[in-house]
C-alpha cells in the first residue's frame, strides 16, 4: 500500500504519527502552550493521501494559531470591561454590578492558555427568585429570566463555540437549579489536569460517600450519598482501542485505569469493576457478574492482559456498542438479583469512558445511555444511582457535543472533560480520588498529590509543646487522642501548660489544643536499669494524650490507622476474621521494611525497619555506645523486643524533637502506624541552625547511627486497655 507524503510540518509546532506513514496512521499536531494547531490532525488514507477530518476544501498548510477566550455576549444588571470580540491569553475581563445588585462569582477573570477563563461566572443578583440567578457564562446566550420554582432557563452558545453542561435547567423546590452550569468553549479548548482532578474527584467522592463503616454515627457527605456496608458500587471502565489511539496511548489508558482501580479499592466500600475495551466492537475483559470483579488483583490482572491487538480487525469507534455492553451486563445482573430486590436497587453505577474521538459507527451512544437510565430507573429521586464520566483525550477529534451529551449533569459537578494528552489523563487519575477531603474519621489518608503541603501529606502529625518550645511529636489516632512517647513528659504530672498543635486548613501555624488527660505508661522509667550500668532505658516509652476537644477532620487533620483495629482492617481490605497477628504479618513482612517518619520541618523521611535476623545485627551496634551503657553485657537488656530498629545504610535518623512521632508505612494508598520514634545513637539536628538543616553522620562514626522505635504490635495490651472504647480492636 502506498505511504503518505512526509511534507506535513507545522510551522512553530510538532507532530506525532500513530502508525508511521502507512495508511490508517493518524498524524496529530501540537503547539506550544497558548497556541493551537489548525488543523489538529490528518489521517493517512488508503490512497496514500492525507485527509483532514471534517475539512471540506483541499489540504491547507498546518499552522499554530493563538488561543483566544470567548467574549461575554450579554451580562445582566451590570457592565464588563474591556469589550472585545474575543480575548487573548493573559487578558482580563472585569465585572461590576448596578446599584441594588450584589456580585457573585469572580469580579475579574483571566484568559488561560487552554482557551478557558479562570474563576467563576460573574452574576449580578438581587436575591429575588426562589433560585439564585443562574447567570450567563461567557460566550452564552440565555432565554428565560424568571427564577421561581418550576421555571426553566435555556442556553445556547454564540458563533462556533461548543456548549458543555446543561442546555436547559429548571429551578427545583430546594432552591437549586437542575443539571450543571453550561460553559461555552472554543472547539480547540481543553481542560488542565489540575482542574479536572478535583472536579472529577469531588464528584466521585460524592458518589462514593466513602463512609467509614465502623463509625458509630454516620455523617453524610457532599450529595449525601451513602454507600453503607450493605451498599455496592459497580464501576464500568470503558477504554477506547480504536485505530486513532496509538499503542503507547492505550498503555497509558490501561495504567490510568489501574490507578483508578487501585484507588477505588482503597475506599471502604463494596465494589465490582467491569473492564471493557472497544473499537468497532466491544470486548468484555471483566464483568461485574464475575466474582473476580470484586478482587482488586484479579481486576488489575485482567487490565494488564488487555491487548491493543485485540481490536486490529475492526478499528472504528463504536461507543454505542461499548455502552450497550454495559446495559446488557446491567440487564443480566437485574435478572439474576430480581428487579424488585433491594440487592439490585441499592447498587450504584459509575461508568468511566476514556476515548480519543467521536463515535463513527454503530449509531448514537446517547441511545445506549437512555437504555441504561431506563433500566436503572433514573429519575429525580434516583439520580444519585448513576454517574457517567466522559473523558476525551487528545483535543484532536474529540467531539465536545457528544461527550457532553453522554456525561451526567449534576449540580455543582462536571462529568465531561477533554484533556490534552494521555499524560494529562494519568495525572488526573493519580490525583482525582483524594479521600483526604472527607469529613469523617476515615483513618490513614494522606494527600499524595505533588502540590499537597507537608501537613496534608501526613495529616495525623502533631507537635507537642510543654511551654513555648516544641519538644516532641505525636500522631492523631482518633479525633481526640494522640499517641506519643512517654519520655516527652518528665516534669511530673502537671500538663496544664502543655499544648498539642494539630494541622488546620485555615492556618499554616495549625491549631492549639489543651490536654484533658495524659496517660503515661506506668512501666516507663528511664532510670530503671541505672544500677546495671544502663544510664538511660526506654522500655514502655509510650503515652496517650486526650485532647480537651475533638479535632474537626479536614485535609490537614485526620487520624492514622492503628494496626490490629477494625479501621485498619478495612483500609487493608482484609477479610473480617483477621487477627492482630495477620496485620503484623502483612505490614512487617520482610527482613527490611521501608517506612517513614516526619521531620521537624514537616517533610516525610525514609527509614528501613529491620526484622528477623537483620533486627539482631541492627541492634548489636548498641554495645559500642560506651557513654550511655558503660558496662553492657547483653544488648537485649537495652534493646528489648519492644523496639523496632532502623538507621542502617541510607536511612535518615530522627532528631530528639521528632520523638513520639509516628513510624508508618503505606499500603494501598493508606498509612499505618507500626511504631513511634523513641531513642537513638545519633542526633542529626544537634546544634543545627534551624529545622531545615540535618547533618549526616560521618561514615567513620563509632557507634554508627541506630534508631529505636516502640513497636505497637508489642504494646497491644496497654493500647487496648486505654483505647478499647475509642477504637475497635481485632483479636490478638
Amino acid at each position: 500500500a502506498p505511504s503518505c507524503p512526509q511534507n506535513v510540518n507545522i510551522s512553530g509546532g510538532t507532530f506525532t504519527l500513530s502508525h508511521g506513514w502507512a495508511p490508517g496512521s493518524l498524524l496529530t499536531y501540537s503547539c506550544p502552550q497558548g497556541l493551537y494547531p489548525s488543523p489538529a490532525s490528518r489521517l493517512c488514507k488508503s490512497s496514500g493521501q492525507w485527509q483532514t477530518p471534517g475539512a471540506t476544501r483541499s489540504l491547507s498548510k498546518a499552522v499554530c494559531k493563538p488561543v483566544r477566550c470567548p467574549a461575554p455576549v450579554s451580562f445582566e444588571n451590570g457592565i464588563y470591561t474591556p469589550r472585545l470580540g474575543s480575548y487573548p491569553v493573559g487578558g482580563n475581563v472585569s465585572f461590576e454590578c448596578e446599584d441594588g445588585f450584589i456580585l457573585r462569582g469572580s469580579p475579574v477573570r483571566q484568559c488561560r492558555p487552554n482557551g478557558m477563563w479562570d474563576g467563576e461566572t460573574a452574576v449580578c443578583d438581587n436575591g429575588a427568585g426562589h433560585c439564585p440567578n443562574p447567570g450567563i457564562s461567557l460566550g452564552a446566550v440565555r432565554t428565560g429570566f424568571r427564577f421561581g420554582h418550576g421555571d426553566k432557563v435555556r442556553y445556547r452558545c454564540s458563533s462556533n463555540l461548543v456548549l458543555t453542561g446543561s442546555s436547559e435547567r429548571e429551578c427545583q423546590g430546594n432552591g437549586v437549579w437542575s443539571g450543571t452550569e453550561p460553559i461555552c468553549r472554543q472547539p480547540y479548548s481543553y481542560d488542565f489536569p489540575e482542574d479536572v482532578a478535583p472536579a472529577l474527584g469531588t464528584s466521585f467522592s460524592h458518589m462514593l460517600g466513602a463512609t467509614n463503616p465502623t463509625q458509630k454515627t454516620k455523617e453524610s457527605l457532599g450529595r449525601k450519598i451513602q454507600i453503607q456496608r450493605s451498599g455496592h458500587l459497580n464501576l464500568y471502565l470503558l477504554l477506547d482501542c480504536s485505530q486513532s489511539v496509538s499503542e503507547n496511548d492505550f498503555l497509558i489508558f490501561k495504567e490510568s485505569a489501574s490507578l483508578m482501580v487501585d484507588r477505588i479499592f482503597s475506599f471502604e466500600i463494596n465494589v465490582s469493576v467491569a473492564i471493557i475495551t472497544f473499537a468497532s466492537e466491544p470486548k468484555v475483559l471483566m464483568s461485574v457478574l464475575n466474582d473476580n470483579s470484586r478482587d482488586m488483583t484479579e481486576v488489575i490482572s485482567s487490565l494488564e492482559n488487555a491487548n491493543y491487538k485485540d481490536h486490529e480487525n475492526g478499528t472504528g469507534t463504536n461507543t454505542y456498542a461499548a455502552l450497550n455492553s454495559v446495559y446488557l451486563m446491567m440487564n443480566n445482573q437485574m435478572r439474576l438479583l430480581g428487579m424488585e430486590t433491594m440487592a439490585w436497587q441499592e447498587i450504584r453505577h459509575a461508568i468511566i469512558l476514556l476515548t480519543d474521538g467521536k463515535s463513527n459507527m454503530g449509531g448514537s451512544p446517547k441511545t445506549a445511555v437512555d437504555h441504561i437510565r431506563e433500566i436503572l430507573n433514573i429519575n429525580q429521586k434516583r439520580n444519585d444511582y448513576l454517574d457517567i464520566y466522559a473523558i476525551g483525550v487528545g483535543k484532536l477529534d474529540v467531539d465536545w457535543r457528544e461527550l457532553n451529551e453522554l456525561g451526567s449533569k449534576k449540580d455543582g459537578e462536571r462529568h465531561a472533560f477533554i484533556l490534552q494528552d494521555t499524560k494529562a489523563l494519568h495525572q488526573v487519575f493519580e490525583h482525582m480520588l483524594d479521600v483526604s477531603k472527607l469529613t469523617d474519621t476515615i483513618c490513614g489518608v494522606g494527600n499524595m498529590s505533588a502540590n499537597a503541603s507537608d501537613q496534608e501529606r501526613t495529616p495525623w502529625h502533631v507537635t507537642i509543646k510543654p511551654k513555648s518550645q516544641e519538644t516532641c511529636r505525636g500522631a492523631l489516632i482518633s479525633d481526640q487522642w494522640v499517641l506519643t512517647a512517654a519520655h516527652c513528659f518528665r516534669d511530673g504530672n502537671d500538663h496544664s501548660l502543655w499544648r498539642v498543635n494539630v494541622g488546620d486548613p485555615k492556618s499554616q501555624w495549625g491549631k492549639e489544643f489543651l490536654i484533658e488527660k495524659a496517660v503515661i505508661s506506668p512501666g516507663f522509667d528511664v532510670f530503671a536499669k541505672k544500677n546495671q550500668g544502663i544510664l538511660e532505658f526506654y522500655g514502655d516509652d509510650i503515652a496517650l494524650l486526650k485532647l480537651a476537644q475533638k479535632v474537626k477532620m479536614s485535609t490537614h487533620a485526620r487520624p492514622i490507622c492503628l494496626p490490629c483495629t477494625m479501621e485498619a482492617n478495612l483500609a487493608l481490605r482484609r477479610p473480617q476474621g483477621s487477627t492482630c497477628r495477620d496485620h503484623e504479618n502483612e505490614l512487617l513482612n520482610k527482613q527490611s521494611v521501608p517506612a517513614h517518619f516526619v521531620a521537624l520541618n514537616g517533610s516525610k523521611l525514609n527509614i528501613n525497619l529491620k526484622m528477623g535476623v537483620e533486627w539482631t545485627s541492627c541492634a548489636e551496634v548498641v554495645s559500642q555506645e560506651k557513654t550511655m551503657f558503660p558496662n553492657l553485657t547483653d544488648v537485649r537488656e537495652v534493646v528489648t523486643d519492644q523496639f523496632l530498629c532502623s538507621g542502617t545504610q541510607e536511612d535518615e535518623s530522627p532528631c530528639k524533637g521528632e520523638s513520639g512521632g509516628a513510624v508508618f508505612l503505606e499500603r494501598r494508598f493508606r498509612f499505618f502506624q507500626v511504631g513511634l520514634v523513641s531513642w537513638g545513637l545519633y542526633n542529626p539536628c544537634l546544634g543545627s541552625a534551624d529545622k531545615n538543616s540535618r547533618k549526616r553522620a560521618p561514615r567513620s562514626k563509632v557507634p554508627p547511627p541506630r534508631d529505636f522505635h516502640i513497636n505497637l504490635f508489642r504494646m497491644q495490651p496497654w493500647l487496648r486497655q486505654h483505647l478499647g472504647d475509642v477504637l475497635n480492636f481485632l483479636p490478638l
Epitope: 519538644t471 544510664l535 539536628c685 541552625a689
Partner: nanobody
C-alpha cells in the same frame, strides 16, 4: 523558662585547663537537656557539647572531642564544662543553653546565658 548564668572564663595559656560553670534557676533544670555553645569574634555561634536531662548521654563537636568534658549536678542546678589541652582556636565567648527537646536548634533556643569569655593565648 530557665535563667542561666555562666562563670569560670578567663585567660589561659595554650595547653592549659579551665572549668566553666553554668548556674540555673528554676526547679525544672533537671528536666532540660543542657549544652555549651561558643562564638569566636566574627564567626557564627557553634555547638560545643550537650548532656541529656538524665546525665546519661553526652555529645561533643568533633573539634573538642577528647579534650572537653560536659557534666551536670542536678542537686545543685549546675552545668559544667571541663576544658583541657586548650588551643588558641578555642578562644571565644562560651554560652550555656537549656533545651527541652535536646536538638539545640539555634533558631529555637530561648534559654541562653549572657556568656563568659575564654581567651587562650601565650
Amino acid at each position: 523558662q530557665v535563667q542561666l548564668v555562666e562563670s569560670g572564663g578567663g585567660l589561659v595559656q595554650p595547653g592549659g585547663s579551665l572549668r566553666l560553670s553554668c548556674s540555673a534557676s528554676g526547679h525544672t533544670f533537671r528536666s532540660y537537656y543542657m549544652g555549651w555553645f561558643r562564638q569566636a569574634p566574627g564567626k557564627e555561634r557553634e555547638f560545643v557539647a550537650s548532656i541529656s536531662w538524665t546525665g546519661g548521654s553526652t555529645e561533643y563537636a568533633d573539634s573538642v572531642k577528647g579534650r572537653f568534658t560536659i557534666s551536670r549536678d542536678n542537686s545543685k542546678n549546675t552545668l559544667y564544662l571541663q576544658m583541657n589541652s586548650l588551643k588558641a582556636e578555642d578562644t571565644a565567648v562560651y554560652y550555656c543553653a537549656a533545651d527541652y527537646s535536646g536538638d539545640f536548634l539555634l533558631s529555637d533556643l530561648d534559654s541562653w546565658g549572657q556568656g563568659t569569655l575564654v581567651t587562650v593565648s601565650s
